[in-house]
Interface confidence: low
């Protein structure tokens, strides 16, 4: 005769308020012959929670039918959970006795607790932005989960971080938790594509995390380099003078051509591109009048990116009735 | 990276009891349930129970209910299995090991076990 | 409590041979709310602590190789090790987590031939 036992896989279940719970038990042998009851708790002070063949029971039902002569399902479901519901759910075999019934098994238990989902996590970057090389700091909230266990990750472009800081309030008992966690990303060059996720994995989630994304282009500034160079070729009196403003971001970008020290007004002719790594190219044209009797003509190209410091390069125009090789030199 | 890291071996006599240690790190402690398996020389595996070291609630093997005592101090992501009244019988490496799963899901709450300890060596002589 | 029964007790295979374990248990481990089977397998080597292999009965833990396979369903599982390589050596054991206690079989000792 195979021995009895009684199978209550679930250690914890979490329910939410107003739902409904499913506590699983069953047995494995018909024998001995008795009832099964359910109790929550142990001891003398247990409470009955479901006994099939006397008391009412309005919120309690069975999902197996209990008169069949072959069941061995006798878990049942509980309606319309509420916080008092909670703690710890067993199902207990008696054995037929007199002149009363002996208990002859209890089940291992299942813990009810009730479970909220965490909010989708919320990630925030820094105030201002930072150039490469530099670390920068994202934060990542997410609030209103039970219970209080909860694991939370970071990643940069698919490849998980660990440099950050965690923590979970409040430390005691509550009926809602939130996290926050602050992770530390030291920027490349080529981030303005890149995005930090943060994920969120709770029991509520039934292994389907939550994530909260930011991208690294709102925190990133990639200075430009500048270059200046003459075109060989001269139109006339005109000498054709490009200012090569190259992998910068964001676009926000101011320039301006001096000649001789004394700022151009006039317009100039430029073109923007897009770089597949998302930074930027600005190339700017300017025309300059000269004759063959002029002084030469220092030129410079300024620009001002994204609210710093503005950089220029300075270009020597040598012009001669053979006109020479120009050379070039840069200031901060 | 994840470990369990234990303490080290322990002489005993019959009678004393015995406390281990088991110190988890590279994860979120209180996530995980942790278990203690035993296994006595050139023999097989003995699961003796768990531990959530959130709640701090335990579920023992009826063979050793009464004999043996799980707790946990979060504040070193440390996990204790106190066994007492040891007898000859009792000398085994013992083991601890965390449940494959970060949660319990609606459907199931026991699982296989993904990292283990080194082992402890507890040798039970007069 | 549910009991795990390994067999053989010992098994000698050439290498690159397969090699096949199997685990009874006496009552089933699909569980039919979810329809799985609660069973893992663990690889043992001389003074290292088990390894786990196989959880749900044929699902690869990750970063163990493709050779090691498992399947099976109700009472009856097996491990399979289809071309046996030399760090293989070792005692294998199936374990039951439908129902506390938890159960091991008593293991299996894979030797090369």
């Known amino acids: 005769e195979e021995e009895l036992q009684m199978i209550q896989p679930e250690k914890l279940l979490l329910v939410t308020v107003g739902k409904t719970a499913t506590l699983h038990c069953t047995v494995t042998s018909l024998l001995p012959v008795g009832p099964v009851l359910w109790f929550r708790g142990v001891g003398p002070g247990r409470e009955l929670i479901y006994n099939q063949k006397e008391g009412h029971f309005p919120r309690v039902t069975t999902v197996s039918d209990l008169t069949k002569r072959n069941n061995m399902d006798f878990s049942i479901r509980i309606s319309s959970i509420t916080p008092a519901d909670v703690g710890t759910y067993y199902c207990v075999k008696f054995r037929k006795g007199s002149p009363e019934n002996v208990e002859f098994k209890s089940g291992p238990g299942t813990e009810m607790a009730l479970g909220a989902k965490p909010s989708a996590p919320v990630v925030l970057g820094p105030a201002a932005r930072t150039t490469p090389e530099h670390t920068v700091s994202f934060t990542c909230e997410s609030h209103g989960f039970s219970p209080r266990d909860i694991t939370l990750k970071w990643f940069k472009n698919g490849n998980e971080l660990s440099d950050f800081q965690t923590n979970v309030d409040p430390t005691g008992q509550s009926v809602a938790y939130s996290i926050r966690s602050t992770a530390r990303v030291v920027l490349d060059p080529w981030d303005v594509r890149s995005q930090v996720i943060c994920e969120v994995a709770h029991v509520t989630l039934q292994g389907d995390p939550l994530r909260g994304t930011a991208n690294l282009s709102e925190a990133i500034r990639v200075p430009p380099t500048l270059e200046v160079t003459q075109q060989p070729m001269r139109v006339g009196n005109q000498v054709n003078v490009t200012c090569q403003v190259r992998k910068f971001y964001p676009q926000s970008l101011q320039l301006t051509w001096s000649e001789n020290g004394n700022v151009c007004q006039r317009e100039t002719a430029s073109t923007l591109t897009e770089n597949k790594d998302g930074t930027y190219n600005w190339t700017s044209w300017f025309l300059v009048n000269i004759s063959d009797q002029r002084d030469d003509v220092v030129l410079t190209c300024q620009v001002k990116h994204d609210g710093q410091l503005a950089v220029s390069k300075r270009l020597a125009l040598e012009v001669t009735v053979h006109q020479k090789d120009q050379s070039s030199d840069a200031t901060p | 990276q994840v470990q369990l890291v234990q303490s080290g071996a322990e002489v005993k006599k019959p009678g004393a009891s015995v406390k281990v240690s088991c110190k988890a790190s590279?994860?979120?402690?209180?996530?995980?349930?942790i278990n203690w398996v035993r296994q006595a020389p050139g023999q097989g595996l003995e699961w003796m129970g768990w531990m959530n070291p959130n709640s701090g609630n335990t579920g023992y093997a009826q063979k050793f209910q009464g004999r043996v005592t799980m707790t946990r101090d979060t504040s070193t992501s440390t996990v204790y299995m106190e066994l007492s009244s040891l007898r000859s019988e009792d000398t085994a490496v013992y083991y601890c090991?965390?449940?494959?799963?970060?949660?319990?899901?609606?459907?199931?709450?026991?699982?296989?076990?993904?990292?283990w300890g080194q082992g402890t060596m507890v040798t039970v002589s007069s | 409590d549910i009991v795990m029964t390994q067999s053989p007790d010992s098994l000698a295979v050439s290498l690159g041979e397969r090699a096949t374990i199997n685990c009874k248990s006496s009552q089933s481990l699909l569980y039919s709310s979810n329809n799985k089977n609660y069973l893992a397998w663990y690889q043992q080597k001389p003074g290292q602590p088990p390894k786990l292999l196989i959880y749900?009965?044929?699902i690869r833990e990750s970063g163990v190789p493709d050779r090691f396979s498992g399947s099976g369903s109700g009472t009856d599982f097996t491990l399979t090790i289809s071309s046996l390589q030399a760090e293989d050596v070792a005692v294998y054991y199936c374990?039951?987590?439908?129902?506390?206690?938890?159960?091991f079989g008593q293991g299996t000792k894979v030797e090369i031939k």
């Open positions: 749900w009965a044929s």
């Open positions: 090991a965390r449940e494959s799963y970060a949660y319990c899901s609606s459907t199931s709450c026991y699982d296989a076990f993904d990292i």
């Open positions: 374990q039951q987590y439908l129902s506390p206690p938890l159960t």
């Open positions: 590279g994860y979120t402690f209180t996530s995980y349930d």
